[in-house]
Structures are given as C-alpha cells and as structure tokens.
C-alpha cells in the first residue's frame, strides 16, 4: 500500500477532531499507546481505546449512509416529482374529457343527455377506477356503457312503444353475444374500447413504474451496511483519527475501492438502464400512437358517432330486435309516460365537437410532460454506476483530485495506493483488495425484481398489452383509430441510451415541495464529463 | 466527427415561406435520444430557439413561433429542415441548426445561414 | 415561460481582470444550464454545462457557479481572445430560452 513517509507521536490533532465531535477527551490519550486492543486499525501505535475504535466504526457507517442517502435523494425526488405530475395531469384528462362530454352532448342533445346523465357519469367512474384502483373491469364497464346506453337509446327510436324490462333485458343481451351480429352502434364500441384500453393500460403503467422506481430506489439508499464493509469504512475514514494523522485525507482508489464494494451487491444496476428505457418507450408512445389526450377527446366522439349509427340504421337494427325480443305493445294514449317529444328523438344524433385541443388547469400537456421526463432521467441514468465516484467525492471520504499525486491514508499509514480500483459487476468485485463481496441480500433481490417487473409491465403496455389481466387482448395489438403517427424513424428503434459517458455528480432537489431532503454540500467533485458524444 | 450544415435561400419576400435544411454528417440523424434543433439570432440580438424535432418524430416548438413553424426530417438524406410561413421583415436572422442530446447543451452547431427578408 | 436576466448586458475590464457575469431565472431552474461564448460571425460555443461543469478542452479560467434561479459565469484572468458576447441558457422547461447575452471588451 506504500509507505509512511512520517511518524506522528501524539495525539493532539485527533483530540482536538475528536473532541469537536463530542467525544470525552478522557477516552482519548495525548499520546500514542499500544495498538494491540484494535480490532480493525493497524495494530500499531494508536490514540484509539477499543471503545473509541467502535464508536468510530458506527460513526463511519453513518458518514457513508448519510452521503448515499444525500446523493441519491435528488433521484427521489425525480421520480416522485414526474410520478406527481403525470398522475395529476392523467386525472385531469379524465376530468376535463367527462366536461367536455358534458357540455358537447347537453349542446347537442339537450334534455336527451341530461335526463341519461348518470350513465355517462358511471363510465367516467369506472374509467377512473380502473386507473387509479383496481386495474380490472375495464371491459365491463365499457360494456355496461354501451349496453346502458342502447337501453336507454332504443326506447326513444320508438316512441310509439312501450318497453318492458324483459325486453330491456333481451336487448341488452343481443348486444352481448358473442357473434356480435347486432352491432347497433356499430364499430364504435370496439373502437373506443381499443383506443381507451391502450391509452388507460399504457398510463397506469407508466405512473406506476415511477411509484415502483420511487418506492424500490427509497428502501436500495436505507440500505444496512454489513459487517465486512463497515470494517473497510472504518479503515477508510476512522483509521486516520486512530494513528494520530485526521488531517491525511483516504486515497482516492482506496475510498474508491470500499465504496465499490460496499455498494456492488446494493444497487439496482443491472436493471436500472432496462427500467428508464422503459419509462421512455412508453411515455413516448403515450404522446403518439397511444395518445391519452386523444383518447381522452375522442370519448364523447366515438359516443357520438356510435348514436349517429344506431339512428342511421335503425330499421335494420329494429328489425333485428323485434325479430329476436318480440314486438313491444304499443302506447296508451293515456298512460302514455311522457316519451321525449318525437321532434327530439327524430332530430340528428350528431355531437359537433370543438377542434381545440385540450390543457390542464396549469396549461400542462403531455407533450410537455414526456419531454421534461427525458430531460430529467437523463440525469439518472448513471446514478448507480456513478455513485462510487460520487461519495468518494466529499471532503470526508478521500483526498481531492487536485491533490492526486500527494501522499494520502493507504489504509496502512501515509503514501501512494497501489492497489487497481476495481469498478465493475459483483463478479469483478471478487477481486477488491479492501472487502469481500457478498452477493446480493434477499431484500436487494426482491428490489430488482420489482424493478424488473415494472419494466416488464411498461413495456408490455408500449405494445398495447396489459400484464395486469391473465389474458392479453387479442385486439391489443390492431391499429388505433387512424391517428398519423410515426412510431420511430426507423423500425425497432427505442428512445433508450444517449452515447456513454461517465456519470453526472447528484443533483441539489428541485424546490417545488416535496419535501425532500436536500443533497449533501458537496455535490460536485464529479470527474469533468466527458462530452465528445459519439455518433 | 459530427457536423452540421444549414443550407437555403438567403432572401426570402415577406409573407412567404422561409425554407432551410440542415445536412448532417460524420453520424446518423436517427441516432436515438437525438433532439435536431433551430435556433435563430436577428442581427445584433440574441439567441432564440425555434424548436427541436426528436429522433422518434416528436416535434416542440417555441410558442412565440408555433402557428408558422414546422420542422421536418428526411433520414433518407440524413438532413432535416425548418419551415417558416408568412414570414416578415422580423424574422430576418442568422439561422443555427444544432444537436442536442436530452439533458444536455446544444452542441455541436453548424455555422448558421443568413436569412434576410425583404421585399 | 422562464426569462432568464443577464447583467451586465456589456462590460468592459482589463486583461489579467477577473470578470463576472450574472444569470437569473424568473424560476426555479435546478441547475439545467449552461453558458456559451459567441465570437463575431461564427456560431456559439459550449463552454460551460449543468451550471457548474467545464466543458472539455475549455481553459481552467472559465468557470460557473449557481443553482435555482441565481448563476453566476466567471473568467479568473481575462485573455485578449475572451473577447465575445456570452449567453446563459436553461433547458429546465420549455421553451428553451436564452439570456439576452453580455458583451465583453477589452479596456
């Protein structure tokens, strides 16, 4: 590890750091004594009783704890801050689509639409539970829809009839077999159902693999520090105050290796980049051909045009029900429960929508938002590889850069470390001269097969499938309505890895109240990134 | 080694359409995570940003501009292009293309083309 | 959208001078920014990226500092060559903006 060029024989520099820290001065000699009670420093001359030596040990993982937890709160708060935002504005799609239905088909319809209102109103609340709770039931709602609104909707092509609820009832399941032969509002069902399904599908998934990327990246920083790399912290940083030199700051590719090692088996690298570049395929497909703002539009049109069907071919469809429900009695005149006058149901079921294109309250739109997501996990995507580099970057942990080729705390004593840094996988961590890996703990598992799942779950609903239903729709993968869209430039191409460079430092957190703690003041001893973008 | 070249008409007639692309070499435009981007600077002003095309086809634009903008990108030729409707004497600039890489500075820059417009 | 304020919007110091340039964001702007040299008739230039990282191959004597809404663009000892018009830019939010740039002369 090379050697120590000068001996220090007291001990007043750590009494002083020491003290400053709150430790009792009477733990602590004012000269070296004999080394042989340590169990982790050299066993040599020491200022180091052996409960000094443990409380330093617990000081050292609280150091290092604090620093991953400051670094990567800045991550954090990323992903809950685009978790927020995207399920704020998905919600207030919902909510200005239920509006604006409601205003277009009072318009239209008059009183038509607001004596059915609440069936309206109940798909809006089944398309909300769908995406906020349960993620099932979305095809029976839809159903129930349709179905709700051809027995409200037939009852007024025949004024002259009165309608039993056996008839309804008949109707209803016409409507529902599986050959599909009515069709009374024709292929608007299928439609709506295929543009909702992969719009709602494709924004649970993304506002829930932000929470999962939150939650699993929150419990990956709280990570407890094991026996073997709270012995290499101690010899990184506590060992210095024990042998009398707190002022000789760790080497670099010392603090470089522990930090390795103590964080190779923790984090989430391998599925990290899989997990952002699905977070990217699928925000990207929800601003194109999977698009929520137009799918959200489209609701009260498709309605619209499924009305326009049954009245344009309401003979044919009448035929067909009569033929299969029986022929309703005729109306009393006296009894006759007042029916919408004929005027209103023989006018146009035509809704004319507005062509202007909807916001949100805080004028957000999705276009917006999906590119503050790539600016945003841009910052991200090394964080994991990067976060070595990134605690051996505070004054506390390792020497300077500047300082680089100046004598430094080997571990040992003061010199140069000679050891190779090892960076890499767990596999290239066998080889770390300052720890033994372990592999990855039970809970660490569990983290990234979270994470994996998630992944999986988002890029599943890219494709227009829903993971969350056992089985997938066979309708999923059909074209959407006609939207003009280029999926990419060029086939297969996914909004994935921008060209390799070295990670960026931690970012302060945004203030925009979440209440996240803030990073640790020195953020940004990051090696200068490299910049010379490959093409 | 990337480089971009912005090519077009140097004089336009007011009300009518500025036209200019931007040719890239030395790298592919439908690299991924690639934003291909316009600036302009009216002579002795400063810089604005027209508006970016991402590699995926997803277009934004600067609001101040959006109603006469539209960029476009050829990969065939690996170019793409800025077009700019009902111009006037206002929009007589220097016109940059540039990359941008999400979450980064526009870099690199072609050299900019001198747009006048005038009748 | 966020304005972003340079000021000076001119300056004029001395070679050897330490010269100091500021940036505010009308918002809060993390540390998306980035500044960029513009000599005369030729394209800007990245010098610095993220507020406070040297871009590479720029001399040691530039440097930036800042987070939020307050940056700060700093040239240690002026060199006749750093004559040009520097501009800040955020890409926090869209529209990308720029500031309106300040021109720096030599006395």
């Known amino acids: 590890h090379g050697s120590e060029a000068k001996v220090v024989r007291s001990c007043a520099e750590t009494r002083q750091v020491l003290g400053a820290r709150g430790y009792s001065l009477n733990l602590i000699p004012p000269s070296l004594i004999s080394g042989e009670h340590l169990q982790v420093c050299p066993q040599e001359y020491t200022c180091c009783s052996s409960e000094t030596e443990q409380k330093l040990i617990r000081d050292a993982e609280v150091t290092f704890r604090g620093l991953v937890e400051d670094s990567g709160s800045f991550l954090i708060h990323t992903l809950a801050a685009r978790h927020r935002k995207f399920n704020e504005f998905f919600r207030e799609m919902l909510s200005i689509s239920q509006h604006s239905l409601a205003q277009l088909f009072s318009h239209s319809y008059g009183r038509l639409y607001s004596q059915h209102a609440v069936i309206f109103n109940s798909l809006f609340s089944g398309l909300r539970d769908y995406y906020e709770k349960s993620g099932e039931g979305l095809d029976d709602t839809l159903a129930d829809f349709w179905a709700q609104l051809l027995e409200r909707a037939f009852p007024l092509l025949h004024p002259q009839y009165s309608f039993p609820p056996d008839f309804l009832l008949c109707l209803t399941r016409l409507t529902s077999t599986a050959d599909g032969s009515l069709q009374p509002f024709g292929d608007s069902p299928r439609r709506l159902r295929l543009q909702i399904s992969r719009a709602l599908v494709a924004a649970r998934a993304l506002v829930q693999g932000l929470e999962t990327g939150r939650n699993v990246v929150s419990e990956a920083l709280k990570v407890p520090v094991l026996e073997g790399c709270r012995q290499a912290l101690m010899r990184l940083i506590g060992c210095p105050l024990c042998r009398g030199v707190p002022s000789l700051m760790p080497c670099r590719g010392f603090c470089l290796n522990v930090a390795h090692g103590c964080l190779s088996s923790r984090g989430l690298e391998p599925e990290w980049g899989g997990y952002l570049d699905g977070l990217l395929l699928l925000a990207e497909k929800l601003q194109g051909p999977f698009s929520f703002e137009l799918a959200a539009e489209s609701i009260g049109v498709k309605i619209s045009e499924g009305l326009m069907h049954l009245q344009e071919n309401s003979v044919k469809v009448s035929a067909k029900v009569f033929q299969e429900c029986g022929t309703p009695h005729p109306v009393q005149s006296r009894s006759r429960r007042a029916p919408a006058p004929r005027e209103e149901a023989s006018r146009s079921w035509r809704a004319s929508a507005e062509e202007e294109r909807p916001t949100t309250a805080a004028g957000t739109n999705l276009h917006r938002l999906v590119w503050e997501l790539r600016e945003r996990l841009s910052r991200v995507r090394g964080f994991w590889a990067g976060l070595p580099v990134t605690v051996c970057g505070d004054s506390r942990m390792a020497a300077d850069l500047s300082q680089e080729t100046a004598p430094c705390w080997t571990g040992v004593g003061r010199g140069r470390y000679m050891s190779p840094v090892v960076v890499g996988s767990l596999n290239e961590q066998l080889h770390n001269p300052e720890l033994d890996t372990s592999s990855p703990d039970v809970p660490t598992r569990r983290r990234r097969l979270h994470l994996r799942a998630a992944t999986a779950r988002m890029k599943a609903a890219a494709l227009g499938q829903d993971l969350d239903m056992h089985d997938a729709d066979e309708d999923a993968s059909g074209s959407g309505g006609g939207q003009q869209y280029a999926d990419d430039w060029k086939a297969g191409a996914v909004p994935v890895v921008p060209p390799a460079r070295p990670p960026r430092p931690p970012r302060p957190p945004r203030r925009d109240g979440l209440g996240v703690r803030g990073g640790s003041g020195s953020a940004r001893y990051n090696q200068g990134r490299s910049r010379n973008l490959g093409s | 080694q990337l480089q971009l070249q912005e090519s077009g008409p140097g004089l336009v007639k007011p009300s009518e359409t500025l036209s200019l692309t931007c040719t890239v070499s030395g790298g592919s435009i439908s690299s991924s995570s690639y934003y291909w981007s316009w600036i302009r600077q009216p002579p002795g002003k400063g810089l604005e940003w027209i508006g970016s095309?991402?590699?995926?086809?997803?277009?934004y634009y600067n609001p101040s501009l959006k109603s006469r903008v539209t960029i476009s990108v050829d990969t065939s030729k690996n170019q793409f292009s800025l077009k700019l409707s009902s111009v006037t004497a206002a929009d007589t600039a220097v016109y940059y293309c540039?990359?941008?890489?999400?979450?980064?500075?526009?870099?690199?820059w072609g050299q900019g083309t001198l747009v006048t417009v005038s009748s | 959208d966020i304005q972003m304020t340079q000021s000076p919007s001119s300056l004029s110091a001395s070679i050897g001078d330490r010269v100091t340039i500021t940036c505010q964001a009308s918002q809060d702007i993390s540390d998306y920014l980035n500044w960029y040299q513009q000599k005369p008739g030729k394209a800007p230039k990245l010098l610095i990226y993220d507020a406070s990282n040297l871009e590479t191959g720029v001399p040691s004597r530039f440097s930036g500092s800042g987070s939020g809404t307050d940056f700060t663009f700093t040239i240690s000892s002026l060199q006749p060559e750093d004559v040009a018009t520097y501009y800040c830019q955020q890409y926090d939010n869209l529209p990308i903006t720029f500031g309106q740039g300040t021109k720096l002369e030599i006395k």
């Open positions: 095309i991402y590699y995926s086809g997803s277009t």
């Open positions: 540039a990359r941008r890489v999400s979450g980064h500075p526009f870099d690199p």
